[in-house]
């Protein structure tokens, strides 16, 4: 049996819920270097791919040492937002370019997804501040051509790698200080 | 061809520190970890840390934290270990090798450095 | 920090036979669709050798005989059919927690 009505719920062990969010993230991260991988391997392209309105990557190893759960996990939500919505627009704009691709791409995103609602359901655990509603962001542009939608294919597959692996940095080292 | 070349054997007295390069070429260098393994003679492999080129955030294995120090220097795409206070168990073999972003498996290996630590 | 343990420490078998090698982790090391064990092969005087990761994917370049299977907390390493070149060392890693440990290694010798 359960607690008794009304008793208030024995507080999850904080190191624990980080753990399960940082296995969870690195799943998706699997996911994203075996997509990576098919995506060089099917449409190649050489050099540095980048698109504008991605988020700029969190923070450096300086940065890294000082971090604070609060503000990790706030700016990871809001990293992983903006990649959820380049990967649903990717998905639409780029429907029979990416075919190929597509159950993987269909799986990121709801793993994806599923990290965004752990880390929502880890700052509600941790009594963290709860962020306001996002502003709506401005529509993303459609690519220019296919071309141009495949190299946006690989710059937003390779920001989601690199900030993954910073989450899970920032993420363990967090969880040592707890 | 991917490949990783160390730096030369070292003999080092107690208490002395060491510093191993390890030379990344084939690949894009940002693209992977680095990590550093130890294998001391009839010892199991140790993993002792690894570092993102792009981040730099060295995450330490506890045993080796405040002795290993892990850096890089990405505009020659090399990685370097200098570990400290060394002892007559730091004895051993240490490799550079690539890992996977934050999955720690190791899919490349420098040659290995022998490291002695004699007085 | 998660225990290895390989079985047997050592194997004698002909060219041509099949080897079964295992690793018990002392804790669950799958979760989240994915098993953090990897497995090495290595020669004396030479550096380990990725040969699978993940407990079943093939590395690139490893040839096809090598495979691997389990979850949970016991995994496998097979040969189907042992050439000259494969008598050496085999470790298990895991990089479920930090930090990743491996196994003690078990040695294939020519009988």
């Known amino acids: 049996p359960g607690p008794p009505p009304g008793s208030p719920r024995a507080s999850p062990d904080p190191r624990a819920e980080l753990d399960s969010t940082v296995l969870l993230t690195r799943s998706l991260l699997e996911d994203t270097r075996q997509l990576t991988i098919q995506l060089k391997d099917k449409f190649p392209a050489d050099g540095d791919h980048n698109l504008d309105s991605l988020p700029t990557l969190a923070m450096s190893a300086g940065a890294l040492g000082a971090l604070q759960l609060p503000s990790v996990l706030t700016r990871l939500r809001a990293d992983l937002l903006s990649y959820l919505r380049h990967v649903q627009w990717l998905r639409r704009a780029m429907g029979s370019s990416l075919k190929t691709l597509e159950p993987e791409l269909g799986t990121l995103q709801t793993r994806l997804d599923r990290l965004l609602r752990r880390l929502q359901l880890l700052m509600s655990r941790l009594a963290l501040p709860q962020l306001p509603p996002d502003p709506p962001a401005p529509p993303l542009a459609p690519p220019s051509s296919t071309w141009g939608g495949i190299r946006a294919a690989h710059a937003i597959l390779g920001g989601l790698h690199l900030t993954l692996d910073w989450a899970v940095r920032g993420l363990l080292l967090l969880k040592t200080r707890l | 061809e991917v490949q990783l070349v160390q730096s030369g054997a070292e003999v080092k007295k107690p208490g002395a520190s060491v510093k191993i390069s390890c030379k990344a070429s084939?690949?894009?260098?940002?693209?992977?970890?680095m990590d550093w393994v130890k294998q001391a003679p009839g010892q199991r492999l140790e993993w002792i840390g690894d570092?993102?080129?792009?981040?730099?955030?060295?995450i330490y294995n506890q045993k080796f934290t405040g002795r290993a120090t892990l850096t890089v220097d990405k505009s020659a795409s090399t990685a370097y270990m200098e570990l400290s206070s060394l002892r007559s168990e730091d004895t051993a073999v240490y490799y550079c090798?690539?890992?996977?972003?934050?999955?720690?498996?190791?899919?490349?290996w420098g040659q290995g450095t022998t490291v002695t630590v004699s007085s | 920090d998660i225990v290895l343990t390989q079985s047997p420490a050592s194997l004698a078998l002909s060219p041509g036979e099949r080897a079964t090698l295992s690793c018990r982790a002392s804790?669950?090391?799958?979760?989240?669709?994915?098993?953090?064990i990897h497995w090495y092969q290595q020669k004396p005087g030479q550096a380990p050798r990725l040969l699978i990761y993940?407990?079943?994917n093939l590395e690139s370049g490893v040839p096809a005989r090598f495979s691997g299977s389990g979850s949970g907390t016991d995994f496998t390493l097979t040969i189907s059919s042992l050439e000259e070149e494969d008598f050496a060392t085999y470790y298990c890693?895991?990089?479920?927690?930090?930090?990743?440990?491996f196994g003690q290694g078990t040695k294939l010798e020519i009988k």
């Open positions: 993940l407990a079943s």
């Open positions: 890693q895991h990089s479920r927690d930090l930090p990743p440990t």
């Open positions: 090798a690539r890992g996977a972003l934050a999955h720690w498996y190791f899919d490349v």
């Open positions: 804790k669950s090391v799958s979760t989240e669709g994915y098993s953090y």
């Open positions: 570092i993102n080129p792009t981040i730099g955030a060295p």
């Open positions: 084939g690949y894009t260098f940002r693209d992977y970890n």
